[in-house]
Interface confidence: medium
C-alpha cells in the first residue's frame, strides 16, 4: 500500500470514556504532530480518514459511519460517539492524505463501565483546593463542544455516592461547585452528571474528579531546615561511617519545585572524588506539605573528610535556605599511663 508518515501509537493520549455516553475525540495529528490545523488541511484538499483496530484484534477496519441514529460520526477533525458501546474499545487511527501526502497516528480508546456510585477504572484528574482560603470553585470538566450554547443542560453534583444538597460548605451552582471554606473533610471524589437533549434523545455526561485540600498560600513559608542544626555535632573518628541527615519542611505551594541538595566544600557531591552516597525520602502531611530528608553518607570517613564543610541547601518558590552541619574529628581519650604521669607531676 502507499507510503505514509506513521506516528505510531500515541499512548500519551490514553483516552477513557464512559459506556453509553457521548464522546468527542479530536484527531491528535492537528494537536500534537502537525504544524497546521484541520481547516488548512481541508482547504488544501487533504482528506481525513478514520479507522480502528478492535481490542485483541490485528485487523484494521473502517469505522462504520452508517449506523442507526448516526451513532458514530465525524465532524471536521472530531470523531463522535452518540453514545459509546463497550465494544468500541480499541486503537483508533486518523489518517490525513491526498495523492501525494499521507500522515497518520493511532491512539487507544477505552470504553469504561461505572457503577451506581461512579466507581470505575477511569483515571481521575485531581483538583487542589486551599485549606480555609475563602470561596473556591471546581468546574465540571471536558464538557465543551457537546451541545450548543442555546441548550441549557441540567447538572447534578455528587460527592461519592451522595447527591450534593444541603451540604454545609459545598454549594452546586450549575457547571460549578463552590466550596465556601475548604476543609480536610472535603477530600474525596466529586461527580457532575450533565444531562442534555439532542434530536429527541437525552444524553448524559459523567465527569468525576478528585478534590484534595492542600496547604494555603497564606500560610506558606520558605523551606525550613530542621537538620542539620546548631544543637547536633557530628563527631567521628577516622574509619567510622559519617551519616548526616538533611531534613527540610516545605509548605505546600502549587506548581512549586522543591529541591534539597548537599554541597561539600562548596561543590556538589558528584563533582568531588570522595565516596559519598546520598539517599532521599519524602513524606507528606494531609495538606501536602512536604518533608524531604537527604542522608549524606561516607562509609569510611578520613581525617581530611572531617575537616570539610558540609552544607545542606533547600529551595522552593518561596525562597532558598542553607545550613552547615557541625562536623569534627573526635579527640581520642588520653591513655591511662599518661594520665597518671600527669597526675604525679602535678603534686
Amino acid at each position: 500500500s502507499e507510503r505514509c508518515d506513521d506516528w505510531g501509537l500515541d499512548t500519551m493520549r490514553q483516552i477513557q470514556v464512559f459506556e453509553d455516553e457521548p464522546a468527542r475525540i479530536k484527531c491528535p495529528l492537528f494537536e500534537h504532530f502537525l504544524k497546521f490545523n484541520y481547516s488548512t488541511a481541508h482547504s488544501a484538499g487533504l482528506t481525513l480518514i478514520w479507522y480502528w483496530t478492535r481490542q485483541d484484534r490485528d485487523l484494521e477496519e473502517p469505522i462504520n459511519f452508517r449506523l442507526p441514529e448516526n451513532r458514530i460520526s465525524k465532524e471536521k477533525d472530531v470523531l463522535w460517539f452518540r453514545p459509546t458501546l463497550l465494544n468500541d474499545t480499541g486503537n483508533y487511527t486518523c489518517m490525513l492524505r491526498n495523492t501525494t501526502y499521507c500522515s497518520k497516528v493511532a491512539f487507544p480508546l477505552e470504553v469504561v463501565q461505572k457503577d451506581s456510585c461512579f466507581n470505575s477504572p477511569m483515571k481521575l484528574p485531581v483538583h487542589k483546593l486551599y485549606i480555609e482560603y475563602g470561596i473556591q470553585r471546581i468546574t465540571c470538566p471536558n464538557v465543551d463542544g457537546y451541545f450548543p450554547s442555546s441548550v441549557k443542560p441540567t447538572i447534578t453534583w455528587y460527592m461519592g455516592c451522595y447527591k450534593i444538597q444541603n451540604f454545609n460548605n459545598v454549594i452546586p451552582e450549575g457547571m460549578n461547585l463552590s466550596f465556601l471554606i475548604a476543609l480536610i473533610s472535603n477530600n474525596g471524589n466529586y461527580t457532575c452528571v450533565v444531562t442534555y437533549p439532542e434530536n429527541g434523545r437525552t444524553f448524559h455526561l459523567t465527569r468525576t474528579l478528585t478534590v484534595k485540600v492542600v496547604g494555603s498560600p497564606k500560610n506558606a513559608v520558605p523551606p525550613v531546615i530542621h537538620s542539620p542544626n546548631d544543637h547536633v555535632v557530628y563527631e567521628k573518628e577516622p574509619g567510622e561511617e559519617l551519616l548526616i541527615p538533611c531534613t527540610v519542611y516545605f509548605s505546600f505551594l502549587m506548581d512549586s519545585r522543591n529541591e534539597v541538595w548537599w554541597t561539600i566544600d562548596g561543590k556538589k557531591p558528584d563533582d568531588i572524588t570522595i565516596d559519598v552516597t546520598i539517599n532521599e525520602s519524602i513524606s507528606h502531611s494531609r495538606t501536602e506539605d512536604e518533608t524531604r530528608t537527604q542522608i549524606l553518607s561516607i562509609k569510611k570517613v578520613t581525617s581530611e573528610d572531617l575537616k570539610r564543610s558540609y552544607v545542606c541547601h533547600a529551595r522552593s518558590a518561596k525562597g532558598e535556605v542553607a545550613k552547615a552541619a557541625k562536623v569534627k574529628q573526635k579527640v581520642p581519650a588520653p591513655r591511662y599511663t599518661v594520665e597518671l604521669a600527669c597526675g604525679f607531676g602535678a603534686t
Epitope: S1, E2, T47, L48, I49, W50, Y51, E60, E61, P62, I63, N64, F65, R66, L67, P68, E69, N70, S73, K74, E75, W80, R82, M95, R97, N98, T99, E198, N199, G200
Partner: antibody
Framework: QVQLLQSGAEVKKPGSSVKVSCKAS????????IDWVRQAPGQGLEWMGG????????NSAQKFQGRVTITADKSTSTAYMELSSLRSEDTAVYYC????????????WGQGTMVTVSS | EIVLTQSPGTLSLSPGERATLSCRAS???????LAWFQQRPGQAPRLLIH???RRATGIPDRFSGSGSGTDFTLTISRLEPEDFAVYYC?????????FGGGTKVEIK
C-alpha cells in the same frame, strides 16, 4: 481529475447474477468509499451498499443483504457489485459513486450501467 | 431508516424565477449529513450541496442549502435554462443511506 468508468449494459435472465465493474482513474482510489446506487426506470435513487478499498470491508442495505456482494481490487483501482437471484424488479441503471471520505457525500458518479432482467 | 419526503413533486417555474424545494426527514439528520443532487435526463446525478449548506466544487452560487434537524431547503435564486431537472435530497450519515423521492423542476 478523477473519473469513474463503469462496464457496459447487461441483459440477464431471472435467477441469474450480474457483476458490474467501476474503474477509477486519475486519483487515489483506495482511501475513498465506493458506493452503489440504483435507479429503476422512471423511479428515484436507491442506495445498495459501499466499500472502502483500503480496508476491503463492505456494508450494504438490509434489503440487499445476502444478494449483493461488493468487492474492490486495489491493484486495478476497480470496484465491483454483484447482484444474484435477479428478478424483473432489479431492472435498473446501476451507478457507482465515490464517497468523499468514508462518510461524506457522493461527489463523483459513474456514467451508469443499464441492467435488464427479462425472460 | 430515515425516510426523506420531498415537496412539491413537481415545480413549474419560468427562467429567472426563484425555486424553493423542501425535504423533510422522518428522524433528525444529525451531523448535518444532508446532500442535494441534480439529475438531468439520461445523466448521472451531480452533487450540488453537501453538509446541508456547503456548495460542491464548481456549483454556481445561485444554489444554496439551509435547514437543520428534520427540515431542509434547496433554493435556486434565479433559474437558468440548464437548471430544469430533477432534484434529490439524501441523508448520508445513518445506515441505510436514503434519498428523497425527488422534485421535478419544469419550465412553465
Amino acid at each position: 481529475q478523477v473519473q469513474l468508468l463503469q462496464s457496459g449494459a447487461e441483459v440477464k435472465k431471472p435467477g441469474s447474477s450480474v457483476k458490474v465493474s467501476c474503474k477509477a482513474s486519475g486519483g487515489t482510489f483506495s482511501i475513498y468509499a465506493i458506493d452503489w446506487v440504483r435507479q429503476a426506470p422512471g423511479q428515484g435513487l436507491e442506495w445498495m451498499g459501499g466499500i472502502i478499498p483500503i480496508f476491503g470491508t463492505a456494508n450494504s442495505a438490509q434489503k440487499f443483504q445476502g444478494r449483493v456482494t461488493i468487492t474492490a481490487d486495489k491493484s486495478t483501482s476497480t470496484a465491483y457489485m454483484e447482484l444474484s437471484s435477479l428478478r424483473s424488479e432489479d431492472t435498473a441503471v446501476y451507478y457507482c459513486a465515490r464517497n468523499g471520505a468514508t462518510s461524506d457525500a457522493f461527489d463523483m458518479w459513474g456514467q451508469g450501467t443499464m441492467v435488464t432482467v427479462s425472460s | 431508516e430515515i425516510v426523506l419526503t420531498q415537496s412539491p413533486g413537481t415545480l413549474s417555474l419560468s427562467p429567472g424565477e426563484r425555486a424553493t424545494l423542501s425535504c423533510r426527514a422522518s428522524l433528525s439528520v444529525s451531523s448535518n449529513y444532508l446532500a442535494w443532487f441534480q439529475q438531468r435526463p439520461g445523466q448521472a446525478p451531480r452533487l450540488l450541496i453537501h453538509g446541508v449548506s456547503r456548495r460542491a466544487t464548481g456549483i454556481p452560487d445561485r444554489f444554496s442549502g439551509s435547514g437543520s434537524g428534520t427540515d431542509f431547503t434547496l433554493t435556486i435564486s434565479r433559474l437558468e435554462p440548464e437548471d430544469f431537472a430533477v432534484y434529490y435530497c439524501q441523508q448520508y450519515g445513518s445506515s441505510p443511506l436514503t434519498f428523497g423521492g425527488g422534485t421535478k423542476v419544469e419550465i412553465k
